[in-house]
Interface confidence: low
Amino acid sequence: SERCDDWGLDTMRQIQVFEDEPARIKCPLFEHFLKFNYSTAHSAGLTLIWYWTRQDRDLEEPINFRLPENRISKEKDVLWFRPTLLNDTGNYTCMLRNTTYCSKVAFPLEVVQKDSCFNSPMKLPVHKLYIEYGIQRITCPNVDGYFPSSVKPTITWYMGCYKIQNFNNVIPEGMNLSFLIALISNNGNYTCVVTYPENGRTFHLTRTLTVKVVGSPKNAVPPVIHSPNDHVVYEKEPGEELLIPCTVYFSFLMDSRNEVWWTIDGKKPDDITIDVTINESISHSRTEDETRTQILSIKKVTSEDLKRSYVCHARSAKGEVAKAAKVKQKVPAPRYTVELACGFGAT
């Protein structure tokens, strides 16, 4: 057959769906690879063809659209499973073609099993809520397009295994779950089960997301440098190892880039000739406040190095701060025979 623009296997879009639930999968060609949509392609006389490769097989085969109750069907650029089965797992390909044009992409589909408490190998989206910040809401994700607006689904929310009913600070409001005040105790997995009728059958959609309660912006402060500080002096003799930690606390800030860096005599360590190494470690609190430590190390310090200015800098969306380390050369201990004797008037 003629050449086809093959976008390969799009592993960035690893699609996971639950067993025995409806799934609607849009052909990724129109979303991520081509500059036109399905309607335009269809009007131009292009046809969308679907096929698949079963798990652990090499053979591409057509999708069977003649299963009982139309279990698998195609509607425009969407492949429908009503519902999925475990052995639907595999790599699916959608190909757009006519006599002169061809473009295709494959993507992996994994049908996943869940237990009665909604535990599964499914990768869960994370929704961050600010601690003690007032009313915040999460919305049952990825349910658009499964049923028309005339259908009134029932939605049940669970935290872990438990149905949410009269929780002190969490209220189900249909597709929304309202956190009247988010607390650390609200951390966990929340599941919405959407039940809707279609052609005399009842379908369930299960969506689980992880709620992580994080530091509130009303409590956020600019970076705080705990070290270096005015109370610690790094006093070294030439030839000794100089170790200066720069320890900085960052309040949690959504989408903020936290940075810590050293300057030596106003320059970045990479831009100077001395043999400096910098090691960084990062730790997080329960509300995702961050503490970064960068240890500046000079293995064998020279007297010149001990005269330099060592400044720790930190920056977040809340501001930028800097603190100089107090570095000095250790005064050698007096040699008894000379200095001490002089003190007694010896000549």
């Epitope: 009134k152 600070n169 249909g174 309202s178 009247l180």
Partner: antibody, heavy 118, light 110 residues
Framework: EVQVVESGGGLVKPGGSLRLSCAAS????????MSWVRQAPGKGLEWVGR??????????DYAAPVKGRFTISRDDSKNTLYLQMNSLKTEDTAVYYC?????????WGQGALVTVSS | QSVLTQPPSASGTPGQRVTISCSGN????????VNWFQQLPGTAPKLLIY???QRPSGVPDRFSGSKSGTSASLAISGLQSEDEADYYC???????????FGGGTKLTVL
């Protein structure tokens, strides 16, 4: 900053109709449940009704005194909530407040005065 | 006649602690969270307490809420002149399928 602003209040004769609007901003209106609460002059607060978000079916609930006469609707493209009031009675005279939420009314507008009098 | 019962008035002197009660039944306060609203003279109501004893940001911790069975109460400690207002309790009512309010309590700071 969350804001809800009512408009459309005024004087109307008994049996007449009036439509109140509520313009919302500062939050994802399409996902929010919205409610109307009223307050007759010198009296307490009275819940009128609520509308769920479209994703929750967009269904409405009404207090018994207004059921069948009042209709709550929404236009998510305009971030606007409406209260259509028909067959108005003198006892419907009140300040009408638009509020966010279906159970917990976290933000309120300044209110729109509706006077039903001949 | 309101579904939730509140005393029509309450009073206290500056610095004092006052409590406003709100009584309901199993289909409202007994089953659902209680909200308290403050309405200062000539202004729109403002959410004061929700879900037993949670305060929106900006509400001083002098205001606290509690709930026991089918009754709830609002306590204001260290009373200040600016607390003079009408206070309303509210809850969802299962049997009426709607939100019910108390009749309101007028608080006077003497």
């Amino acid at each position: 900053e969350v804001q809800v602003v009512e408009s459309g209040g005024g004087l109307v004769k008994p049996g007449g109709s009036l439509r109140l609007s509520c313009a919302a901003s500062g939050f994802i209106f399409s996902k929010a449940w919205m409610s109307w609460v009223r307050q007759a002059p010198g009296k307490g607060l009275e819940w009128v009704g609520r509308i769920k978000s479209k994703t929750d079916g967009g269904t409405t609930d009404y207090a018994a005194p207004v059921k069948g006469r009042f209709t709550i609707s929404r236009d998510d493209s305009k971030n606007t909530l409406y209260l259509q009031m028909n067959s108005l009675k003198t006892e419907d005279t009140a300040v009408y407040y638009c509020t966010t939420g279906g159970y917990v009314f976290d933000y309120w507008g300044q209110g729109a005065l509706v006077t039903v009098s001949s | 006649q309101s579904v939730l019962t509140q005393p029509p008035s309450a009073s206290g002197t500056p610095g004092q602690r006052v409590t406003i009660s709100c009584s309901g039944n199993n289909s409202n306060i007994g089953s659902y969270i209680v909200n308290w609203f403050q309405q200062l003279p000539g202004t729109a109501p403002k959410l004061l307490i929700y879900s037993k004893n949670q305060r929106p940001s900006g509400v001083p911790d002098r205001f606290s809420g509690s709930k026991s069975g089918t009754s709830a109460s609002l306590a204001i400690s260290g009373l200040q002149s600016e607390d003079e207002a009408d206070y309303y309790c509210a809850a969802w009512d299962d049997s009426l399928n709607g939100v019910v309010f108390g009749g309101g309590t007028k608080l006077t700071v003497l």
